[in-house]
């Protein structure tokens, strides 16, 4: 008789999850010489240990500490790019501008990007059928706690000018409930971070509005200013052209004519 299994509202663990994490770890450590010392089997064991046999609504940041320790990585603190609701463009950007880093350009972010996982209380099984949904089931689920933990650490490491890419096509350009709004903003360290610069990415070809005047951006400015960090905002009217100009800054079509 099959054992009764909790039905959650969210999708189950990504198929071939253990193999995917292990393969990503091997690939990342091969590409990044500074992480060659990492033992990927130990990384997988620590990752697994964070959620296997635990109730998937009762995961804590503490559960992920062994994984955090193994994945400790130094990125240039003044080259950090945060993003909210515009992951693809942020990743395209750091692929072009190789000295800047999103969270997913670090080992731990790379391992978990776009994956889902959860276990079951008191069994060593991975649940491939369903996992808790943040809204409908519980917030202390394995995936949400992981991203909260790594996002907090990433923000805490930032210094000087920190950049954030925001989606200007959304009704809330800055969303207090996003990972950026609820975790990263509050974990930037005022003694290290001088300025947060927002890049508001426009969606429409002919959209020349100043989205830096949007009420949600003003709300972000207020939160940041209260934390004694300066705030700056730029409209990226043409993200396609912007990427092209980042790739080739000498291109005359990027530059105003005298």
């Amino acid at each position: 008789v099959p054992r009764w299994r909790q039905q959650w509202s969210g999708p189950g663990t990504t198929k071939r999850f253990p193999e995917t994490v292990l393969a990503r770890c091997v690939k990342y450590t091969e590409i990044h010489p500074e992480m060659r010392h990492v033992d990927c089997q130990s990384v997988w064991d620590a990752f697994k240990g964070a959620f296997i046999s635990k109730h998937p609504c009762n995961i804590t940041e503490e559960d992920y500490q062994p994984l955090m320790k193994l994945g400790t990585q130094t990125v240039p603190c003044n080259k950090i790019l945060l993003w909210s609701r515009i992951k693809d463009l942020a990743h395209q950007f750091t692929q072009v501008q190789r000295d800047m880093f999103t969270l997913e350009d670090t080992l731990l972010g790379y391992l978990a990007d776009d994956l889902t996982w959860c276990g079951e209380f008191n069994t060593s099984k991975i649940n491939y059928q369903s996992c808790p949904d943040w809204r409908k089931d519980c917030s202390n689920n394995p995936v949400s706690v992981f991203w909260k933990t790594v996002s907090r650490r990433f923000a805490e490491a930032a210094c000087d000018v920190v950049h954030v890419m925001l989606n200007g096509s959304r009704s809330k350009i800055f969303d207090k409930n996003s990972t950026f709004g609820s975790v990263e903003v509050h974990n930037l360290q005022p003694e290290k971070v001088q300025t947060l610069e927002a890049w508001v990415i426009h969606g429409g070809r002919e959209d020349s509005r100043d989205l830096c005047q949007d009420p949600t951006i003003k709300e972000l400015e207020s939160i940041i200013s209260k934390r004694n960090i300066q705030f700056s905002c730029k409209n990226i009217y043409r993200p396609d052209k912007f990427l092209q100009c980042v790739k080739n800054p000498e291109d005359s079509s990027c530059t105003s004519e005298i």
Partner: nanobody
Framework: QVQLVESGGGLVQAGGSLRLSCVAS????????MGWYRQAPGKQRELVAT???????NYADSVKGRFTISRDNAQNTVYLQMNNLKPEDTAIYYC????????????WGQGTQVTVSS
């Protein structure tokens, strides 16, 4: 807005020299073509000199042969050496990215006042 801090302006007699400096913090300034702009009273802001991240320069006809733009990428600093100054050079001088405003919007610093007396 502290990401662009211009300095070096002042009062100088016609024929004199000044060297303006601009410290620019933030990614867009570090890789983009940078420009020195000026705005005289009652006139529109105009671009007078540009320098690409690779060091290629361009000048407005009115300043050619008198002004020299340079940059120190390691220090995120852009300079404008102004020689043989004329009264018509009197303006507030600003530095900023010279990328087209149809691509990226500009946020301005407070500029530095240059006054040339005859």
């Amino acid at each position: 807005q502290v990401q662009l801090v211009e300095s070096g302006g002042g009062l100088v007699q016609a024929g004199g020299s000044l060297r303006l400096s601009c410290v620019a913090s933030g990614f867009i300034y570090s890789i983009s073509t940078m420009g020195w702009y000026r705005q005289a009273p009652g006139k529109q802001r105009e671009l007078v000199a540009t320098i690409t991240s690779g060091g290629n320069t361009n000048y407005a006809d009115s300043v050619k042969g008198r002004f020299t733009i340079s940059r120190d990428n390691a220090q995120n600093t852009v300079y404008l050496q102004m020689n043989n100054l004329k009264p018509e050079d009197t303006a507030i001088y600003y530095c900023n990215t010279a990328w087209r405003e149809t691509i990226v919007s500009r946020v301005w610093g407070q500029g530095t006042q240059v006054t040339v007396s005859s």
